[in-house]
Interface confidence: low
């Protein structure tokens, strides 16, 4: 951004009203008026080129410094060529000297040369020769000098003539400011340019309305150079949540849009299942019945708990049940559905019901299931079971309603006993069996049926309350078909599969375990 100039003194604009002090009084510098373009112009001129040892001073009025640290002095002047005077005027000069003096008060007409410090010798780039002068075509020179740092309340400038023919048309004194600036959504105030050329004044910016420094970001800063130029921007501001960048400002998100954090991104349209947001929304409120899980980004549509599992079946197989279901018809808009299975049992005789608790076994842990089936085993015979399968997702915890479906099943038979041959001889077979412990209390007796293989006309039955039996009076080297069935108060349970066991031949040794 271009530097801004603040004028402290402008001789040309003052119309001869300034009344500068000349020394010695009445000699040397003189205020003159000319007409240019039908306008009066004023100038201080001196032209004592024929006399030697000139020391003519022109001092400005006292200039209040204000906030300036470094001042710039722009001079517009003409200098006549010494050769344009008769004999070349041996004492003639073509330069003059520029001085300044700082003071805290106006000394008025009390002029003391010793208080002044030389700034520079001012030499023209172009001198006005005789022919130019006669044609009223003077060569105007422009020179600029700067002084700083200034520390007192005010200052004077002085021009020392040492024998030149000079006309001073314009003296303009100003200081420079870096102008007010909006950059990177930060406002930088108008700042006085520093006084030291190498140094850059660091200026802190303030974020525009509704802009903030991003977390971990640098505060906005710029550097104001001596010439009033802004340099080296550092850091930036971003539009805060609910606002987006529009040119150099942060504008509230329009209704129906939102922005959830300070960022460079624009406002986003409210996602599905949100209400029309008001202006400046940082998020879009969910529709009634829809929610956001804590980990959901604001840009994600609002979601709701799933509906119940769509279709649930419980297929009994002896003392086992396979539960199968299909996913909810409405997922709630989420993919993080999990299922949990709970179980109740009811005694038909008493009508009592209670939790299954530890009396059943699941093929996998019954909570947090992602598959849509599970097998429940170790069920008791002649018991009614109710299974509840609940579907949940990431927002189910935000509402009190739950999404579940139930299925009931009656277990009419015990689990088939698992049968093994414990030992055998030429005339006997020792057989044992087991059933799940929860079912054992329901069993009254076990019935063991056996017959010779291939003889379908006759079979033998043995009943026992225990878990083993020895079958005697068997034929040697003969295969028998053996089946065990539990008997409950309500009738027969499921029978075991039919096993083939063979007695030993007479040559074999007795009672060998198979």
């Amino acid at each position: 951004a271009q530097g801004k100039e603040v004028v402290l003194l402008d001789f040309a604009a003052a119309g001869g009203e300034l009344g500068w002090l000349t020394h010695p009084y009445g000699k040397g510098w003189d205020l003159m008026q000319n007409i240019m373009n039908d306008m009066p112009i004023y100038m201080y001129s001196v032209c004592n080129v024929m006399s030697g040892d000139q020391d003519n001073w022109l001092r400005t009025n006292w200039v209040y410094r204000g906030e300036a640290e470094r001042i710039f002095i722009e001079l517009k002047f003409t200098v006549r060529d010494c050769n344009s005077f008769p004999g070349g005027a041996s004492s003639c000069k073509e330069t003059f000297n520029l001085y300044y003096a700082e003071s805290d008060l106006d000394y008025g007409t009390n002029f003391q040369k010793r208080l002044f410090t030389k700034i520079d010798t001012i030499a023209p780039d172009e001198i006005t020769v005789s022919s130019d002068f006669e044609a009223r075509h003077v060569k105007l020179n422009v020179e600029e000098r700067s002084v700083g740092p200034l520390t007192r309340k005010g200052f004077y400038l002085a021009f020392q003539d040492i024998g030149a023919c000079v006309a001073l048309l314009s003296v303009r004194v100003y200081y420079k400011k870096c102008p007010e600036l909006l950059q990177g959504l930060a406002h930088f105030p108008e700042t006085i340019a520093g006084s030291d050329a190498p140094s850059l004044a660091t200026v802190a910016g303030t974020c525009v309305d509704h802009a903030v420094v991003p977390p971990g970001g640098e505060e906005p800063r710029m550097h104001c150079a001596v010439d009033g130029e802004w340099l080296v921007p550092i850091g930036q501001c971003l539009c805060q949540a609910g606002y987006e960048k529009v040119e150099d400002a942060c504008q509230a998100c329009s209704p129906g849009f939102f922005k959830f954090e300070a960022s460079e991104s624009p406002c986003l349209e409210c996602p599905e299942h949100t209400l029309p947001s008001p202006e400046g929304a940082t998020s879009c409120e969910c529709e009634e019945g829809f929610f956001r899980a804590p980990q959901d980004p604001a840009s994600m549509p609002c979601t709701r708990p799933p509906s119940a599992p769509h279709y649930l079946t419980a297929v009994g197989m002896g003392a086992k049940v396979e539960l199968r279901w299909t996913p909810p018809q409405d997922s709630g808009g989420r993919e993080d559905i999990v299922y949990s299975v709970t179980c109740e049992q009811c005694w038909p005789e008493s009508g009592e019901c209670g939790p299954c608790e530890a009396s059943v076994r699941y093929s996998e842990p019954p909570h947090g299931l992602t598959r849509t089936s599970v097998t429940v085993s170790d069920l008791e015979p002649h018991m009614n079971y109710t299974f509840t399968v609940e579907a949940r997702n990431g927002v189910s915890g935000l509402v009190t309603s739950r999404s579940f479906r139930t299925a009931s099943v009656s277990i009419n038979q015990t689990e088939p006993p698992k049968v093994r041959l414990e030992g055998r001889s030429t005339t006997s077979l020792s057989v044992s069996w087991s059933i799940p412990p929860p079912q054992q209390s329901r069993v009254w007796k076990y019935e063991v049926t056996y017959r010779k293989k291939g003889d379908s006309n006759s079979y033998n039955v043995r009943r026992t309350e225990g878990f083993s039996v020895t079958l005697d009076d068997l034929a040697p080297d003969t295969t028998y078909l053996v089946q065990v069935q539990a008997l409950t108060q309500e009738g027969q349970g499921a029978g075991s599969k039919v096993h083939e066991f063979q007695t030993l031949s007479p040559e074999g040794s007795g009672n060998l375990a198979v």
Epitope: P255, G256, L275, P276, P278, A281, T282, S283, E285, E287, E288, P294
Partner: antibody, heavy 118, light 111 residues
Framework: QIQLVQSGPELKKPGETVKISCKAS????????MNWVKQAPGKGLKWMGW????????TYADDFKGRFVFSLETSASTAYLQINNLKNEDMATYFC???????????WGQGTTLTVSS | DVVMTQTPLSLPVSLGDQASISCRSS???????????LHWYLQKPGQSPKLLIY???NRFSGVPDRFSGSGSGTDFTLKISRVEAEDLGVYFC????????FGSGTKLEIK
Amino acid sequence: QIQLVQSGPELKKPGETVKISCKASGFTFTNYGMNWVKQAPGKGLKWMGWINTYIGEPTYADDFKGRFVFSLETSASTAYLQINNLKNEDMATYFCARELGPYYFDYWGQGTTLTVSS
Amino acid sequence: DVVMTQTPLSLPVSLGDQASISCRSSQSLVHSSGNTYLHWYLQKPGQSPKLLIYKVSNRFSGVPDRFSGSGSGTDFTLKISRVEAEDLGVYFCSQSTHVPTFGSGTKLEIK
């Protein structure tokens, strides 16, 4: 400019019904939730609930479930508060208030004073 | 419900003085979004409440900058840097992080 203009004062007997209106102007009615706030004489402010003007869904604070009904006439940009079976403790000034954000209110109606007296 | 406790109940001030009103909540008002939904209203006699400050420190449009809000968690303060005659009335704090509730009010009056 944005305005919420409520119906005038009401004098009712216990057991009667009152319906207070709140007419909105100067903004898109359906873009802002409308809340209702009760101020009993010499008492503080008590939030009664709000109505989602976009979908017409009312939400009631626990103390205002039952006899209180929020409703809308969207075409007229008007919200209503109806109180059934008036009781003495319903005597108060009722304000409608537009929601700037979740339950903070940038514009309020001038209030409707309800006197319940037998 | 969250209880909002305001102190003092009455605040006599001289015009031009600074005034400070405190509001304490029975639960933290930090919302899951990270925002704190604590607001201040002014109710002048015979008028409806007017929003002054929302979300702790956001001054509402048209509210003079002599009003400022600060605080976090459960403790909040409304400051008026130089009280003017038009500032007199009852100030209410309110929270909407949970079910909305209001403080009992602080009456600002001339000393």
